[in-house]
Interface confidence: medium
Amino acid sequence: TPTTLASHSTKTDASSTHHSSVPPLTSSNHSTSPQLSTGVSFFFLSFHISNLQFNSSLEDPSTDYYQELQRDISEMFLQIYKQGGFLGLSNIKFRPGSVVVQLTLAFREGTINVHDVETQFNQYKTEAASRYNLTISDVSVSDVPFPFSAQSGAGVPG
């Protein structure tokens, strides 16, 4: 499964300042998501890209359509979570329904929580439309149950 790793992973401390459009949970941004012993928190994220159409190319990682969309999404997440702690994303899946994107985000333990993952992604939707021509809707974020299968990813949250 394709994986994108963030090139930076410096931990945000309790007094760190988020960029102005992003309200964090608190001044000290802690996580209670399921965590591995290596200190990594995982979040399952699903959203619709309503201005794209799903076709069979998105079932084949070797196609240009798949690779371009995966690249844009990976770059977008590096922009959204550019404060320290974002480790990358994995298990990208594309589904029918315009295009439904499902993926898993990884953060260093203690740097973010599920509330802030969703808030920051929602705050970025307008910029995503202009920068990547992706019209995003129906965002859903949840803690990944632990243990989970790295092959299958997390199930679609209820």
Epitope: A14, H18, S20, V22, P23, P24, L25, T26, S27, S28, H30, S31, T32, N113, V114, H115, E118, T119, F121, N122, D138, V139, S140, V141, S142, P157
Partner: antibody, heavy 122, light 107 residues
Framework: EIQLVQSGAEVKKPGSSVKVSCKVT?????????WHWMRQAPGQGLEWIGY???????SYNPSLKSRATLTRDTSTNTFYMELSSLRSEDTAFYFC???????????????WGQGTLVTVSS | DIQMTQSPSTLSASVGDRVTITCRAS??????IHWYQQKPGKAPKLLIK???ESISGVPSRFSGSGSGTEFTLTISSLQPDDFATYYC?????????FGQGTKVEVK
């Protein structure tokens, strides 16, 4: 002015479910806040149940062991809390509240509903 | 979960008294604590946010202080309208948790 108006009191049998609503006026539930539920047993303190985010995601207090389900209806600007497998210990006032943020982007509960008494009794 | 312990559970006081309520967190929460006032049959009302920050419309006699694990809410001169139950609440971590409450009653 933002207001949160909750549905009326309920009396339920053990093992059944209850669904409490919270209608929001003066602010869209799809914009910039998350929407939470708390409960308070008679004479007791407050317990956080969970939230539905303005983006639609939900999170719950593990203490409720998946008995709580939070949903919303964006067409009526209303959000809901359903609690299943009711037992007598669930008898409480249930409060909805807006979790908002100030100019320094820090979160707190600034507006609350009036409360809904749910009584579980055989 | 972070436990929030308030003391005392009940406080008897008279109008004009200076009243102090303490809240202790089970771990360091910085200043991520809020104080609420609740009257019987009513919803809680926010008094102080982030340990010491005042809320518009709340009388200046209410103040808060502390950081880390020890916090206080002070009412400088108790008024008849202040007889109520007071709660602290942390939002340093999920799940959000509240203290068990301090009831301020007439002496």
């Amino acid at each position: 002015e933002i207001q949160l108006v909750q549905s009326g009191a309920e009396v339920k049998k053990p093992g059944s479910s209850v669904k409490v609503s919270c209608k929001v006026t003066g602010h869209s539930i799809t914009r910039g806040s998350s929407w939470h539920w708390m409960r308070q047993a008679p004479g007791q303190g407050l317990e956080w149940i969970g939230y539905i985010h303005y983006g639609g995601g939900t999170s719950y207090n593990p203490s409720l062991k998946s008995r709580a389900t939070l949903t919303r209806d964006t067409s009526t600007n209303t959000f809901y809390m359903e609690l299943s497998s009711l037992r007598s210990e669930d008898t409480a006032f249930y409060f909805c509240a807006r979790y908002s943020y100030d100019i320094t982007y820090r979160w707190f509960f600034d507006v609350w509903g009036q409360g809904t008494l749910v009584t579980v009794s055989s | 979960d972070i436990q929030m312990t308030q003391s005392p559970s009940t406080l008897s006081a008279s109008v004009g008294d200076r009243v102090t309520i303490t809240c202790r967190a089970s771990q360091n929460i910085g200043t991520s604590i809020h104080w609420y006032q609740q009257k019987p049959g009513k919803a809680p009302k926010l008094l102080i946010k982030y340990a010491s920050e005042s809320i518009s419309g709340v009388p200046s006699r209410f103040s808060g202080s502390g950081s880390g694990t020890e916090f206080t809410l002070t009412i400088s001169s108790l008024q008849p309208d202040d007889f109520a139950t007071y709660y602290c609440q942390q939002n340093n971590n999920w799940p959000l948790t509240f203290g068990q409450g301090t009831k301020v009653e007439v002496k």
